[in-house]
């Protein structure tokens, strides 16, 4: 930010009227009014520039210092080139002193030379050669010079002519300050500039009203530079919660609109399914039967739990169900949708029921599923199960009603056996076979079916309570299709894949293990 | 007391050259510029030039250059002007002339009139 | 050069009238708001006495009868009233640039 001036002397703007020391009185500088681009100016001129040595001084009246610790001196004034003069006026010069004195008083017309410090000779950057102003010829020079630091009450200008052709036309002294700022939501008060160059003042900032620091961030600095500007922001604020930037305010959340924290983001309008909010939100509400989840953003919509799973299937095989389902209508307007499922199963003769999530297995963990199918196995033969699921988002939880389905199964047979080759030779197949243990209890015996394959008109049957066979008295070298059913008092239970095991020829010896 | 005092009158053929001198006091000589000025006809005045005590430096009227030349001497706080080939044009009474304060013809010496003839 | 033009050549006046001579410069004799305008006075077998610097300051031992006026190209010697004194011949004469020049002069006589 640029910096501001105060003015505390302008002799361009005084309009003739300071009264000016000059010595030795009433020759050297004089006041003189001209007309300069069409309008009066005044002027303190002297131009001795042929009558050898000159010492003419001019003096400004005590300018009080105020709250000024340094001050700059702004000139402009015109400088007559010495060769323009008749003979180049030998004794000319084209350039002149600046003096100053500090003091706490008014010394009014008693001048003393020695009580004034050098501050700098003033030589121009372009001189004039023709000196009429109406004629607009007149090369004009700004210089600017400061001082400090000052620390009476007031001071005096001078200006020491050595046999120049000199105009000074405007004298300007004024101090900066840093003007009153706002950034970053800060306020930062008027700050005078400080009086060494290197030396940067280090201003604090309140944060404008609504507005905060954030957590963790840092408080908002500034620096005053010397020459009145402001300089390395620290820090700075936000506009709270419920609270937007307009310009530099912060500004209530229109109703409609709401803002959760403090934070650089313009309000938001408040999402679907939500009541219209009230000026300067923070949130908004949620509709009836809408809910917002804890870790779900204020600028989510609410939403609601979802229905239930839609065309759910429970397909039996064997002492295996596979269940699925289709996701429900209404999601609710939640993508994190995820399903539970539970099991009850209920004994026909005795109609009693209970939980079997002890007694079955299922194909992944039924809590908190993201697929639509699961396979559940180890089911007893002969049983009835009911199987829920239930769909849950993540809002289900602050309701007390429940989105489900479910699909019931009557299991009348065994799971199929598992059948594997435990050894062979040329004339024999060692075989055996498994259940869930659940079912063990209703087998009472095993039935094994075994048949060269390619004759479909004979087939040899070997039962068993055990759960291994060695079927003897088969040909050298053939293929044999075997399998193996449950028998149970309710008659038999599901059969076992037919699988092809083959004796080893007369050239393999031994009873080898597969 | 500021005061000028020119050499006499002088009568000199066309053709030849001649010095006046102007011995200064009341004041520092090196401090100030020396003017001549001439006057014929007893009316119209005419800068010649100035010279500058202190370092020697000299300017001239262009209608003069060639026809007269300045110098000082410090010692006796006095300048001099040679005029060159004079012609009957040339007769008239020179002055002696020191800057005042504001850039004026102040100080006047009692002036020299040189008469031209054959 | 700068060509400076009296007028009248010669004036005649009575004694304890004002007598006015003009001065018109053929450019501007001004410099930072000095007028580098000078009046002599001369009488016959004198050099040319200073009467007014600058165009309108009073040289010092002058009488106060003497004034002058006038900026830029315009410039007036007045005196008012004219004494027996007066008779003399009166020059304008400008610094502001080189050549210093003078005006053809005026004659005042008394009537």
């Known amino acids: 930010a640029q910096g501001k001036e105060v003015v505390l002397l302008d002799f361009a703007a005084a309009g003739g009227e300071l009264g000016w020391l000059t010595h030795p009185y009433g020759k050297g500088w004089d006041l003189m009014q001209n007309i300069m681009n069409d309008m009066p100016i005044y002027m303190y001129s002297v131009c001795n520039v042929m009558s050898g040595d000159q010492d003419n001084w001019l003096r400004t009246n005590w300018v009080y210092r105020g709250e000024a610790e340094r001050i700059f001196i702004e000139l402009k004034f015109t400088v007559r080139d010495c060769n323009s003069f008749p003979g180049g006026a030998s004794s000319c010069k084209e350039t002149f002193n600046l003096y100053y004195a500090e003091s706490d008083l008014d010394y009014g017309t008693n001048f003393q030379k020695r009580l004034f410090t050098k501050i700098d000779t003033i030589a121009p950057d372009e001189i004039t050669v023709s000196s009429d102003f109406e004629a607009r010829h007149v090369k004009l020079n700004v210089e600017e010079r400061s001082v400090g630091p000052l620390t009476r009450k007031g001071f005096y200008l001078a200006f020491q002519d050595i046999g120049a052709c000199v105009a000074l036309l405007s004298v300007r002294v004024y101090y900066k300050k840093c003007p009153e700022l706002l950034q970053g939501l800060a306020h930062f008060p008027e700050t005078i500039a400080g009086s060494d160059a290197p030396s940067l003042a280090t201003v604090a900032g309140t944060c404008v009203d609504h507005a905060v620091v954030p957590p963790g961030g840092e408080e908002p600095r500034m620096h005053c530079a010397v020459d009145g500007e402001w300089l390395v922001p620290i820090g700075q604020c936000l506009c709270q919660a419920g609270y937007e930037k307009v310009e530099d305010a912060c500004q209530a959340c229109s109703p409609g609109f709401f803002k959760f924290e403090a934070s650089e983001s313009p309000c938001l309008e408040c999402p679907e399914h939500t009541l219209p909010s009230p000026e300067g939100a923070t949130s908004c509400e949620c509709e009836e039967g809408f809910f917002r989840a804890p870790q779900d953003p204020a600028s989510m919509p609410c939403t609601r739990p979802p229905s239930a799973p839609h065309y759910l299937t429970a397909v039996g095989m064997g002492a295996k169900v596979e269940l699925r389902w289709t996701p429900p209508q209404d999601s609710g307007g939640r993508e994190d949708i995820v399903y539970s499922v539970t099991c009850e199963q209920c004994w026909p003769e005795s109609g009693e029921c209970g939980p079997c999530e002890a007694s079955v297995r299922y194909s992944e963990p039924p809590h908190g599923l993201t697929r639509t199918s699961v396979t559940v196995s180890d089911l007893e033969p002969h049983m009835n199960y009911t199987f829920t699921v239930e769909a849950r988002n993540g809002v289900s939880g602050l309701v007390t009603s429940r989105s489900f389905r479910t699909a019931s199964v009557s299991i009348n047979q065994t799971e199929p056996p598992k059948v594997r080759l435990e050894g062979r030779s040329t004339t024999s197949l060692s075989v055996s076979w498994s259940i869930p243990p659940p079912q063990q209890s209703r087998v009472w015996k095993y039935e094994v079916t075994y048949r060269k394959k390619g004759d479909s008109n004979s087939y040899n049957v070997r039962r068993t309570e055990g759960f291994s066979v060695t079927l003897d008295d088969l040909a050298p070298d053939t293929t044999y299709l075997v399998q193996v059913q449950a028998l149970t008092q309710e008659g038999q239970g599901a059969g076992s894949k037919v699988h092809e095991f083959q004796t080893l020829s007369p050239e393999g010896s031994g009873n080898l293990a597969v | 007391e500021v005061q000028l005092q020119q050499s006499g009158p002088e009568l000199v053929k066309p053709g030849a050259s001649m010095k006046i001198s102007c011995r200064a006091s009341?004041?520092?000589?090196?401090?100030?510029?020396m003017n001549w000025v001439r006057q014929s006809h007893g009316k119209n005045l005419e800068w010649i030039g100035l010279?500058?005590?202190?370092?020697?430096?000299?300017s001239y009227n262009l209608k003069f250059k060639g026809k007269a030349t300045l110098t000082v001497d410090k010692s006796s706080s006095t300048a001099y002007m040679e005029l060159l080939s004079l012609t009957s044009e040339d007769s008239a009474v020179y002055y002696c002339?020191?800057?005042?304060?504001?850039?004026?013809?102040?100080?006047w010496g009692q002036g020299t009139l040189v008469t031209v003839s054959a | 050069d700068i060509v400076l033009t009296q007028s009248p050549a010669s004036l005649a006046v009575s004694l304890g009238q004002r007598a006015t001579i003009s001065c018109r410069a053929s450019?501007?004799?001004?410099?930072?708001?000095?007028?580098?305008i000078y009046w002599y006075q001369q009488k016959p077998g004198q050099p040319p006495r200073l009467l007014i610097y600058?165009?309108?300051n009073l040289e010092s031992g002058i009488p106060a009868r003497f004034s002058g006026s006038g900026s830029r190209t315009d410039f007036t010697l007045t005196i008012n009233p004219v004494e027996a004194d007066d008779v003399a011949t009166y020059y304008c004469?400008?610094?502001?640039?080189?050549?210093?020049?003078f005006g053809g002069g005026t004659k005042l006589e008394i009537k």
């Open positions: 009341g004041y520092s000589f090196t401090g100030y510029t």
């Open positions: 002339v020191r800057w005042g304060d504001y850039g004026s013809f102040a100080y």
């Open positions: 450019e501007s004799v001004d410099t930072f708001g000095y007028s580098f």
């Open positions: 010279i500058n005590p202190h370092n020697g430096g000299s």
């Open positions: 004469q400008q610094s502001n640039e080189d050549p210093p020049t």
């Open positions: 600058r165009a309108s």
